[in-house]
């Protein structure tokens, strides 16, 4: 399987909410011995390997934000901790998973990574990630809504295998 990032840049005004999205592509093993660990974290630009550094999102680590379930099941993060920080990660039946960030500030600007780990009990694990950038713009003339910019046409799915 692979991870696609439909949009590689999100630009939002301060105070808005944004939902960053990744999509699980390809055959997904729905066997009983397979579970999927999905999570989000921040990283840094200019690394040799994008998303290799894992930094917290609003003080929540990738462990705090993880979803753990089988196949294309739907799931949500535990509400209390994440929602106190204005965050919610979710996953649907179609392989889409997302993190919603509420009341954006300039400090939220940066590179965000989604990570999917396929865990086969007693066997190996397979990891894939996707990267996207969030820019929060401020100013009296800053547009009132988020705008998104798609990933490249050449690799419009912007697929990266870890």
């Amino acid at each position: 399987f692979k991870v696609a990032t439909p949009y590689s840049l999100y630009v939002c005004p301060e105070g808005q909410n944004v939902t960053l999205t990744c999509r699980l592509l390809g055959p997904v093993d729905k066997g009983h011995d397979v579970t999927f660990y999905k999570t989000w974290y921040r990283s840094s630009r200019g690394e040799v390997q994008t998303c290799s550094e894992r930094r917290p999102i609003r003080n929540l680590t990738f462990q705090d934000l993880h979803l753990h379930h089988g196949g294309h099941q739907a799931a949500n993060t535990s509400h209390d901790l994440a929602q106190r920080h204005g965050l919610e990660s979710a996953s649907d039946h179609h392989g889409n998973f997302s993190i919603t960030m509420r009341n954006l500030t300039l400090l939220d600007s940066g590179l965000y990574c989604c990570l999917v780990v396929e865990i086969r009990h007693h066997h190996s694990e397979h990891r894939v990630h996707g990267a996207m950038e969030l820019q929060v713009q401020t100013g009296k003339d800053a547009p009132s809504n988020c705008v998104v910019y798609p990933s490249s046409s050449q690799d419009s799915e912007n697929i990266t295998a870890a």
Partner: antibody, heavy 120, light 107 residues
């Protein structure tokens, strides 16, 4: 002040490849924003062709995707459009354009446009 | 693709009139909509972005409103120099799409 200027042949033969360049001054195209190509057939409306991002990402309109290539020459601070297998329907004024000083603020900066006629 | 439909396609009004042009999107575009003015033989000029934000240097007689699927460009008091074709454009979804244009003439 950001300025854009298109250049390229004004006449292209059917089935050949149209090639245009947009030279940018007043701003480095690798510093930010998205650099777009838009066209307008004579007497008709505007059609978005595609963009090149500051980080090299490129996105094309699906209707032209199979024929269009956008590339960049960072050393000359310019980006280019190639449209293959042209027909008379590709006759248009071709513009390069960039958003305003905010992302998502519409196309504030335009080149003067260059008319490309497809004819044998 | 999102279809942008402008109405009317052409209109004639007198100097000093209040003029309204509407733009309807085939699906929700939030407020990610711009309006342009294009005079004959000239480059399009940005008037309004984010549905209602007047671009720098644009006269205050131009205003925009709306969100979702229905948008309006209003010229509060038509001036002779406003003779042009006006286009709306959505930038909420790709490909970016423009309305077919509204040609404005002076009576």
């Amino acid at each position: 002040q950001v300025q854009l200027q298109e250049s390229g042949p004004g006449l292209v033969k059917p089935s050949e490849t149209l090639s245009l360049t947009c030279a940018v001054s007043g701003y480095s195209i690798t510093s930010g924003y998205f650099w777009n190509w838009i066209r307008q057939p004579p007497g008709k409306g505007l059609e978005w062709i595609g963009y090149m991002g500051y980080d090299g990402r490129i996105f094309y309109s699906p209707s032209l995707k199979n024929r269009v290539t956008i590339s960049v020459d960072t050393s000359k601070n310019q980006f280019s459009l190639k449209l293959s297998s042209v027909t008379a329907a590709d006759t248009a004024v071709y513009y390069c354009a960039r958003e305003g000083d905010y992302y998502g603020s519409g196309f504030a900066y335009w080149g003067q446009g260059t008319l490309v006629t497809v004819s044998s | 693709d999102i279809q942008m439909t402008q109405s009317p396609s052409s209109l004639s009004a007198s100097v000093g009139d209040r003029v309204t042009i509407t733009c309807k999107a085939s699906q929700n575009v939030n407020t990610n909509l711009a309006w342009y003015q294009q005079k004959p033989g000239k480059v399009p000029k940005l008037l309004i972005y984010s549905a209602s934000y007047r671009y720098s240097g644009v006269p205050s007689r131009f205003s925009g409103s709306g969100s979702g699927t229905d948008f309006t460009l209003t010229i509060s008091s038509l001036q002779p120099e406003d003779v042009a074709t006006y286009y709306c454009q959505q930038y909420n979804n790709y490909p970016l799409t423009f309305g077919q244009g509204t040609k404005l003439e002076i009576k």
